[in-house]
């Protein structure tokens, strides 16, 4: 008689990352009997929801269901029907919704209500939709990359199973860049974390971690650009803004009402004698860099050292994984290689920003002009943020690893979020039989 394969004893989990510019759905899978082991959960699917972030649906909340349909249907297809009812679904909203909540708690609640109702219509075990804090976003990103890199495993290996692995148990720091916020999270070396708001204590797999984290709201790449435009238009002599962060020959009309729509530009708001202005690109990296630096207030620091805006930042320690928009932007610019020095990156950015807009459009015909036009700003912003904001240097640049995926799973906060909510990160090192669930993070 033929041997029949035993049915796979696996579990699934779904996390939706409702970011400021888009929503992505991630499906994770793991062997049921090994759920307390480190490194067994992996991503089997990413579905990018077609359209903008959920905060954009504030005036048409009844359409959120349509927006989510395609990816939820994809989850229905990927996960075996027999597993649907026991598959947890979590939605975490990040800085786009934090900003909406700052403007109107009622509107933010309404959006989340409709999201919850829409997700409850599917045959999965819906566990709720919420706005996660910046601290959580940083912490879960840190957990994700270190889980995937095998840093929580107590077994020492003489071989490397993942890229970037330095074959020690020293954790990687996490650098996350979104559209509306950016997070920095790492374990400082024997350094007191001077600001309690930035301190996290974890016990994971039998080891204690004192982790520093901070989320800079309004310093994601999209909101940073709005901030820069709002700052620069203050001193423009007329409704023409000659902008070094856009390619020579680039032109775009901006509505002043759009500029002041976000809470991130409130500090620069003023009455202007025009309703619209035109950005005219001049494509100068150095001037763009200078303009960006004006967004970082480094004149005030109540601690031994700061990042910017009076926020404590301990001395940088160890290797860092830079993911999300850090990776996407640098990947587009072809600057993710470990061999590219910071000086070389700066050189390449100078050349890229100076390229005429017509030339850029021809070279990247398949890319939407809105995205394409902003790579000069975004690349320059990443350099400014890492070097002047977080105090990386030409020497420490080599400790930054631009990471998209690790072992097939996207780097980002979603995996860490699910691991925590499904109690899959034990505080103590598991014995051969799983421990009780009483000591989890």
């Amino acid at each position: 008689t033929q041997n029949k394969a035993l049915p796979e004893n696996v579990k699934y989990g779904i996390v939706l990352d409702a970011g400021s510019s888009h929503t992505s759905l991630y499906i994770y899978k793991w062997p049921a009997e090994k759920e307390n082991d480190t490194g067994v959960v992996h991503q089997v699917e990413e579905c990018r929801v077609k359209g903008p972030g959920i905060s954009k649906f504030v005036q048409k909340v009844n359409e959120i269901g349509i927006y989510l349909t395609d990816c939820m249907e994809r989850a229905r297809e990927v996960i075996p029907r027999s597993q649907h009812q026991e598959t947890p679904v979590y939605l975490g909203a990040t800085a786009g919704m934090r900003l909406l909540r700052m403007e109107s708690e009622e509107l933010a609640d309404r959006v989340l209500d409709v999201v919850e109702r829409s997700l409850s219509n599917y045959p999965f075990d819906f566990q709720g939709a919420r706005i996660i804090t910046g601290q959580e976003e940083g912490a879960y990103g840190w957990i994700t990359i270190n889980y995937l890199l095998g840093k929580f495993s107590q077994k020492t290996r003489w071989f490397s199973i993942v890229p970037y692995e330095t074959n020690n148990q020293e954790t990687f720091g996490a650098l996350d860049l979104g559209g509306a916020s950016t997070q920095v999270t790492f374990v400082p070396q024997n350094q007191t974390i001077e600001s309690p708001d930035n301190a996290l204590q974890f016990r994971l797999y039998g080891k204690d971690y004192n982790v520093y984290t901070h989320s800079f709201l309004c310093y994601g790449k999209d909101q940073a650009l709005w901030q820069k435009l709002a700052k620069d238009i203050q001193v423009a002599s007329n409704e023409i803004l000659r902008d070094p962060c856009f390619h020579p020959g680039y032109k775009k009309v901006v509505n002043v009402s759009d500029l002041y729509k976000t809470p991130c530009t409130k500090r620069f708001e003023m009455t202007l004698p025009f309703q619209q202005f035109e950005i005219q690109g001049i494509g100068n990296y150095q001037q763009c860099h200078q303009s960006i630096l004006e967004l970082f207030n480094t004149s005030y620091c109540p601690y031994s050292q700061c990042a910017f805006n009076g926020i404590f930042l301990p001395p940088l320690q160890g290797d860092f994984g830079a993911f999300s928009a850090f990776y996407f932007v640098m990947k587009f610019l072809n600057l993710t290689s470990e061999k590219v020095s910071q000086e070389k990156v700066t050189e390449m950015m100078k050349k890229f920003c100076a390229q005429p807009w017509e030339e850029i459009k021809t070279s990247y015909a398949g890319v939407k002009e809105k995205y394409l036009s902003e790579y000069c700003f975004s690349g320059t912003y990443i350099l400014s943020l890492l070097l002047q904001g977080y105090h990386f240097t030409a020497d420490s640049w080599e400790h930054i690893h631009f990471i998209g995926k690790i072992q097939g799973s996207d780097a980002g906060w979603t995996l860490g979020y699910m691991l925590n909510l499904t109690n899959m990160i034990p505080a103590e090192q598991p014995l051969s039989t799983p421990l009780s669930h009483s000591t989890y993070v």
Partner: antibody
Framework: EVQLQQSGPELEKPGASVKISCKVS????????LNWVKQYNGKNLEWIGN????????RYNQKFKGKATLTIDQSSSTAYMHLKSLTSEDSAVYYC??????????????WGQGTTLTVSS | EIVLTQSPAIMSPSPGEKVTIACSAS?????MHWFQQKPGTSPKLWIY???NLASGVPARFSGSGSGTSYSLTISRMEAEDVATYYC?????????FGAGTKLELK
């Protein structure tokens, strides 16, 4: 403005194969699923399947599995549908199209002009 | 798959008359979309998400319904409304269309 430009009419013999193209402009190619629809007798509309240029993932209507293969060429922002083992039943107008929400959460739905396929000996 | 049944198949209203086209789904769908197609042209999105008019669609058109029963209504038929109208569901795969309702002028 989103535009979908399809290849011209095709006349094929039974048993042959054909590849219809759909070139997209005016938006980022990886942002939306590209759908294919068959219209025969100038009336009945049937969804064939779609491809997600972001992930490369495809979905097919069971009825067209083995008949249609959907692919993309990201460098030229072009989607293709390959139809094989053609019979007279495949004579129809084929449309590519995409729909979804733009950056301002406005719903849109755009179709190519259609490609007429005639299968005849 | 979800089967959509449209009725009637053909309709010949007089100008100014109220027109209602029905679309019934074999199982519940969250939303219904409607397309207008004129001979020799591609289908055009006419109503999306049950009741929202696509850009440029005259206000005499409206859509309603829920679950398995949906409809498109023209408050006062005009000559330019002569076309075939299709319902479509995008709630589950495979996406499906109704067989169409052809509107002619009496």
């Amino acid at each position: 403005e989103v535009q979908l430009q399809q290849s011209g009419p095709e006349l094929e013999k039974p048993g042959a194969s054909v590849k219809i193209s759909c070139k997209v402009s005016g938006y980022s190619f990886t942002d939306y699923n590209l759908n294919w629809v068959k219209q025969y007798n100038g009336k009945n509309l049937e969804w064939i399947g779609n491809i997600d240029p972001y992930s490369g993932g495809t979905r097919y209507n069971q009825k067209f599995k083995g008949k249609a293969t959907l692919t993309i060429d990201q460098s030229s922002s072009t989607a293709y549908m390959h139809l094989k083992s053609l019979t007279s039943e495949d004579s129809a107008v084929y449309y590519c199209g995409l729909y979804g929400y733009d950056d301002d959460a406005n719903y849109f739905d755009d179709w190519g002009q259609g490609t007429t396929l005639t299968v005849s000996s | 798959e979800i089967v959509l049944t449209q009725s009637p198949a053909i309709m010949s209203p007089s100008p100014g008359e109220k027109v209602t086209i029905a679309c019934s789904a074999s199982s519940s769908v969250s939303y219904m979309h409607w397309f207008q197609q004129k001979p020799g042209t591609s289908p055009k999105l006419w109503i999306y998400a049950t009741s929202n008019l696509a850009s440029g669609v005259p206000a005499r058109f409206s859509g309603s319904g829920s679950g398995t029963s949906y409809s498109l209504t023209i408050s006062r038929m005009e000559a330019e409304d002569v076309a075939t109208y299709y319902c479509q569901q995008r709630s589950s795969y495979p996406l499906t269309f109704g067989a169409g309702t052809k509107l002619e002028l009496k």
